[in-house]
């Protein structure tokens, strides 16, 4: 399934929400972790016919910026936008495309976790880690440390009783030429890749660099877990887990509420707060699912992770184009029609009036009155001289009467108003260009 | 700047019918005045049909009765329909629109209609 229309290119980007876990939180709640939107990805256009093939996405990194300490535990919600790049009135047109939600638990510092997330026909993939800035250090960003050489004395914007650790770590030092967008180390020397990107240096992108692929019968993903075949590919840790590779194996850090070697065991309850987007927990009475979230409007799911698409209700009247922008609907209207709704006809004449025996003429999105002869003006109320627009073409000559006016055309012309030449090529008798000739520019008549 | 693109000639048998559209561009064909002309090898450019934009007809006297020309605002088209043909209709039939803001004139790049007899 392509994500742009037949007839018009787009490109994805992406808006990540970070929320602390386990806060209550209510309806739409900022995210208080931190947020972020992706660079657009390149553009994008639909081949009729064609495969539907993996995605090109925004390139590198996206980083989140955190104030405060790390929670170890926090809710994500990964949103993938369409920007349509037609000649839309009032710029590009954005619609969400796919929103997945999860709940985490990760220490800062650690490495790099991997996560497979679907949502509809769609399947992303991606890698996160929570990484402390200097001076902060510890899996919760709450320790400083002093460069090593700093003198002992408290260093200038640290607060005097902020412990303080004995030295920084030396920062790593990947190997030389490394890419410093797709790759990354844990040990000196090492170069791993993100998600998409291979080759010793992670320059070499992963078939189309894409990690959002459709699924489905029609289209072979391409797996996009780098480095190679290892024991976190296709993701073993049930419930959302995220998989870390140990030396011998994988260990799965899994979401609030869900234990086990693979996650696989829940206990989450309402005491968990599972429910998103100030969904209503209420305990169930299933012995199988130990609770229920009852969603608030415009969102559904087992969690109230997914935003209704309130568009597929297609509440735009009159072809008006849906876009759902989260915290509203927009319709945008056809030439012609307005309203929230697009429910107002502009091109209506109900309740116009065109004077002495105007006709109200309904099109091109606005009103306009066809007067009867000897009045104009924009309702028929101007006395007017039906030949002073010079009404008829080619030198016809106009005059004014009863029922209309009437051209007499001049020799060589017909038409109501003159406007069809009977020989335009003139006296000569030219040989018959075959068709597809290309023209010239217009011709101009007085 | 008015663009025309014609389509359905072709080659049909005396006494056959065929359909001509004129698909406009750049301007609504409620604002333009469009006529069909055709053109036989070695001959002059003939006007066929024309309808004005307050959907007045006209009709040289060889197609009258044949020929029907009509427009779809719509679909921004003007169609020249062409029953009873005979072998003297074989020609390039080409697109003209007459545009009164600015009094210009526009041809098409023509198709080709054959009537075999």
């Known amino acids: 399934r392509s994500p742009c229309s037949a007839r018009l290119p787009c490109r994805l980007f992406f808006r990540v929400c970070l929320k602390p876990g386990l806060s209550e939180e209510a309806a739409e709640s900022p995210c208080a972790l931190g947020a972020a939107l992706s660079a657009r990805g390149p553009v994008y256009t639909e081949q009729p016919g064609a495969p539907a093939p993996d995605l090109p996405l925004p390139d590198g990194l996206l980083q989140v910026p955190f104030r405060d300490a790390w929670p170890g535990t926090f809710s994500f919600i990964i949103e993938t936008w369409r920007e349509e790049l037609g000649d839309q009135i009032g710029g590009p047109a954005w619609s969400l495309l796919a929103r997945v939600a999860g709940r985490r638990r990760l220490a800062a510092g650690g490495p790099w976790a991997r996560d497979i997330q679907r949502a509809g026909a769609w399947e992303l993939r991606f890698s996160y880690r929570a990484r402390c800035e200097p001076p902060a250090v510890g899996t919760a960003c709450t320790r400083l440390c002093r460069p090593r050489s700093a003198p002992s004395r408290c260093g200038p914007g640290l607060r005097p009783c902020a412990p303080l650790e004995d030295e920084c770590e030396a920062p790593l030092v990947c190997r030389a030429g490394c890419s410093p967008e797709h790759g990354f180390c844990e040990q000196p020397g090492e170069c791993r890749c993100l998600e998409g990107w291979t080759g010793p240096l992670c320059t070499v992108p992963v078939s189309t660099s894409s990690c959002l692929s459709p699924r489905g019968p029609s289209s072979a993903t391409t797996g996009c877990l780098v480095p190679g075949p290892g024991p976190c590919d296709g993701n073993p840790c049930a419930n959302g887990g995220s998989c870390s590779e140990t030396p011998r194996s994988f260990e799965c850090t899994c979401p609030r509420g869900f234990y086990g070697l693979r996650c696989e065991v829940s206990g989450v309850t309402c005491a968990d707060g599972p429910c998103f987007n100030g969904g209503l927990c209420v305990g169930g009475a299933d012995p199988d699912s130990a609770y229920i979230c009852h969603c608030p409007p415009g969102f559904q799911g087992s969690n109230c992770e997914k935003r209704v698409d309130r568009c597929s209700l297609q509440p735009c009247r009159n072809g008006g184009l849906c876009l759902d922008l989260g915290h509203a609907l927009r319709c945008r209207c056809r030439a012609g029609f307005a309203g929230p709704r697009c429910e107002h006809d502009l091109d209506d004449c109900a309740g116009r009036a065109c004077a002495n025996g105007g006709t109200c003429v309904e099109g091109g999105g606005a009103h306009r009155c066809s007067c009867a002869l000897g009045f104009g003006g924009r309702d028929c109320r101007e006395r007017a001289d039906p030949c002073a627009a010079r009404p008829c073409a080619h030198g016809g000559r106009c005059y004014a009467h009863f029922s209309g006016l009437v051209c007499a055309c001049a020799p060589g012309y017909m038409g109501a108003r003159c406007e069809f030449p009977v020989h335009p090529d003139g006296a000569s008798a030219l040989p018959a260009a075959p068709p597809g000739l290309r023209p010239g520019d217009p011709q101009r008549y007085l | 700047q008015v663009q025309l693109q014609e389509s359905g000639g072709g080659l049909v048998v005396a006494g056959g019918s065929l359909r001509l559209s004129c698909a406009a561009s750049?301007?609504?064909?409620?604002?333009?005045?469009i006529a069909w002309y055709r053109q036989a090898p070695g001959k002059k450019r003939e006007l066929v049909a024309g309808i004005s934009t307050d959907g007045t007809t006209n009709y040289v006297d060889s197609v009258k009765d044949r020929f029907t020309i009509s427009r779809d605002n719509a679909k921004n088209t003007v169609y020249l329909q062409m029953n009873s043909l005979q072998p003297e209709d074989t020609a390039a039939y080409y697109c003209?629109?007459?545009?009164?803001?600015?009094?210009?004139?526009?041809w098409g790049q023509g198709t080709q209609v054959t009537v075999s007899s």
């Open positions: 003209y629109a007459y545009r009164w803001v600015g009094r210009d004139t526009y």
């Open positions: 750049g301007s609504s064909v409620s604002f333009l005045s």
